[in-house]
Interface confidence: low
């Protein structure tokens, strides 16, 4: 059984369904904007063929009007594109989503480079940000099993078009703050995290602001352990290393486990010219294991100082808990001091117990 199974992305966490057909969404766009209307199937299930209708007439796709089963895009919108839009089931003509679209004369994105110029009071909509789909933001607490993909959305509007930023537990949140990174989709006002792990738990706040004001929304993410599971090891760690004779090397291993993990670092050795025993088990020597004063953080790093040619070879990070074991391996290549560094093969071998 490969670790790939353990780390598969189980799927997207279910999103809050769209408004009831009776509810009409009021949307305001600026002239020249792209009008984007989204109508996901109710309950997340299949919804069959659909038709988009404006003011009672079926929309004909064109270069400017892009029609999809769950999405409608009207490019370079003008005043004439204002009206009542609905997405209906083709067979029953049941209204799945209903939108009231208003296209104003003012473009919705401010051109002010420095942000100093106040917008003139021309009577058009200028002002602080507001939520365009508040009913999509009702679910403040999202609980998903580990390995799911999570998406937080804060659809907003304002004039000038507001910016969106994200905080985790009150602090600026950027891609480098989590292994696996994040996807910020500014046009969709969303934050996406794939393959979530327990360390992703916390409060996520979207901050939407323009020069007229600021609004924010906080979501709480809880990541449930998929018990009973052996530890999950971060893909790609430890990574293969190439080092010059006499230099220092560090191997890293990131372990996720809800049950207390036990971490060991092993080096593969040969016994009588053989790498494996009669039962196929590799011969190894334990380089580092939990001691009275070692922390998990310390165990996640193996440091080799002043490496020699004897240090070259295969190294394994082995993590076990009450459920079972997982292990990842990487190779160390040691080069003579006068040779230039040569990149080792990037992909470390991956095993799972």
């Amino acid at each position: 059984e490969s670790l790939g199974t353990e780390q598969r992305v189980v799927g997207r966490a279910a999103e809050v369904p769209g408004p009831e057909p009776g509810q009409q969404e009021q949307l305001v766009f600026g002239s020249g904007d792209a009008v984007e209307l989204s109508c996901p199937p109710p309950g997340g299930g299949p919804m069959g063929p659909t038709v988009w209708v404006k003011d009672g007439t079926g929309l004909v796709p064109s270069e400017r009007v892009l029609v999809g089963p769950q999405r409608l895009q009207v490019l370079n919108a003008s005043h004439e594109d204002s009206g009542a839009y609905s997405c209906r089931q083709r067979l029953t003509q049941r209204v799945l989503c209903h939108f009231s679209v208003r296209v104003t004369d003012a473009p919705s994105s401010g051109d002010d480079e420095d942000g100093e110029d106040e917008a003139e009071d021309t009577g058009v909509d200028t002002g602080a940000p507001y939520w365009t789909r508040p009913e999509r933001m009702d679910k403040k607490l999202l609980a998903v099993p580990a390995a799911n993909t999570v998406r937080f959305r804060c659809p907003a509007a304002g004039n000038p078009t507001p910016s969106i930023s994200w905080l985790k537990n009150g602090r600026e949140f950027r891609g480098e703050h989590r292994i696996g990174g994040i996807k910020l989709r500014h046009q969709q006002w969303s934050l996406v995290m794939e393959s979530v792990v327990p360390s992703d738990r916390g409060n996520y706040t979207c901050v939407v602001e323009n020069k007229f004001g600021s609004i924010r929304q906080t979501y709480t993410l809880d990541v449930l352990e998929r018990s009973p599971h052996r530890p999950i090891l971060q893909a790609g760690l430890p990574a293969n290393q190439t080092a010059v004779l006499g230099s220092d090397v560090e191997f890293h291993c990131k372990v996720y486990s809800d049950a207390q993990p036990h971490i060991q670092w092993l080096k593969h050795v040969e016994v009588n010219g053989s790498k494996v025993g009669p039962d196929g088990t590799p011969y190894v020597t334990v380089l580092k294991t939990a001691g009275a004063n070692t922390t998990d953080k310390e165990l996640e790093v193996l440091s080799l100082h002043n490496v020699t040619f004897e240090d070259a070879g295969e190294y394994t990070c082995l993590a076990g808990n009450s459920i079972g074991f997982s292990h990842h391996s990487a190779w160390l290549v040691v080069l003579p001091a006068e040779e230039e560094l040569v990149e080792a093969d990037e992909a470390g071998s991956v095993y799972a117990g």
Epitope: V10, A13, A14, P145, N148, E225, R226, S227, D258
Partner: antibody
């Protein structure tokens, strides 16, 4: 060996209260999500409530929201379920279970009977 | 009315292969791990299958789980008299923010 031992069940009148306890042993209690699951006589399993390790995030079934409170004391390795405003339909065997996304160990259960 | 749907009963003769189905939706089975539990008469439930198709140690390989889309199934091959029990499927439901079970299937070994 993992063991979960429930206690606190008994006969109570409608509108009354009861507090269930679950003593855990054989594993590091504070590292695990814990849940309560119940089973009415002759019926199927119904998840009641779950609590994340540090009591941070707590979940309840709609049928018990506002009436039941789950809590834990990691120093005592004990899980609790405070049940108020009990109704006849709360009559069931209440199991303590380890896990949140699934349950790998279960206690033997304690019977709660709500009757006048 | 259970969120996950199971047949109320199933039966088979010793040595036979029996399959129990469990259907749900995208917010539970479709996106989350499926678990199967066995409850012998008068005892607490016991974990049989976790994460769709994995067996905890101690569970015979006669028991296997599978999942496709929003449905899952438990297969028991080489049926034995001691397999007579109630079987439940379960999964986390992301819409309800809670765990859901099937109504249970009573397996009779004829």
């Amino acid at each position: 060996e993992v063991q979960l031992l429930e206690s606190g069940g008994g006969l109570v009148q409608p509108g009354g209260s009861l507090r269930l306890s679950c003593a855990a042993s054989g594993f590091t209690f504070s590292n695990y999500y814990m849940s309560w699951v119940r089973q009415a006589p002759g019926k199927g399993l119904e998840w009641v409530s779950g609590i994340y390790y540090g009591s941070g995030n707590i979940y309840y079934a709609d049928s018990v929201k506002g009436r039941f409170t789950i809590s834990r004391d990691n120093s005592k390795n004990t899980l609790y379920l405070q049940m108020n405003s009990l109704r006849a339909e709360d009559t069931a065997v209440y199991y303590c279970a380890r896990g949140g996304g699934g349950f790998d160990y279960w206690g033997q259960g304690t019977l709660v009977t709500v009757s006048s | 009315q259970s969120v996950l749907t199971q047949p109320p009963s199933a039966s088979g003769t010793p040595g036979q292969r029996v399959t129990i189905s469990c259907s749900g939706s995208s917010s539970n089975i479709g996106n989350n791990d499926v678990y199967w539990y066995q409850q012998l008469p008068g005892t607490a439930p016991k974990l049989l299958i976790y994460a769709d198709n994995h067996r905890p140690s101690g569970v015979p390989d006669r028991f296997s789980g599978s999942k496709s889309g929003t449905s899952a199934s438990l297969a028991i091959s080489g049926l034995r008299s001691e397999d007579e029990a109630d079987y439940y499927c379960g999964a986390w439901d992301a819409s309800l923010n809670g765990y859901v079970f099937g109504g249970g299937t009573k397996l009779t070994v004829l």
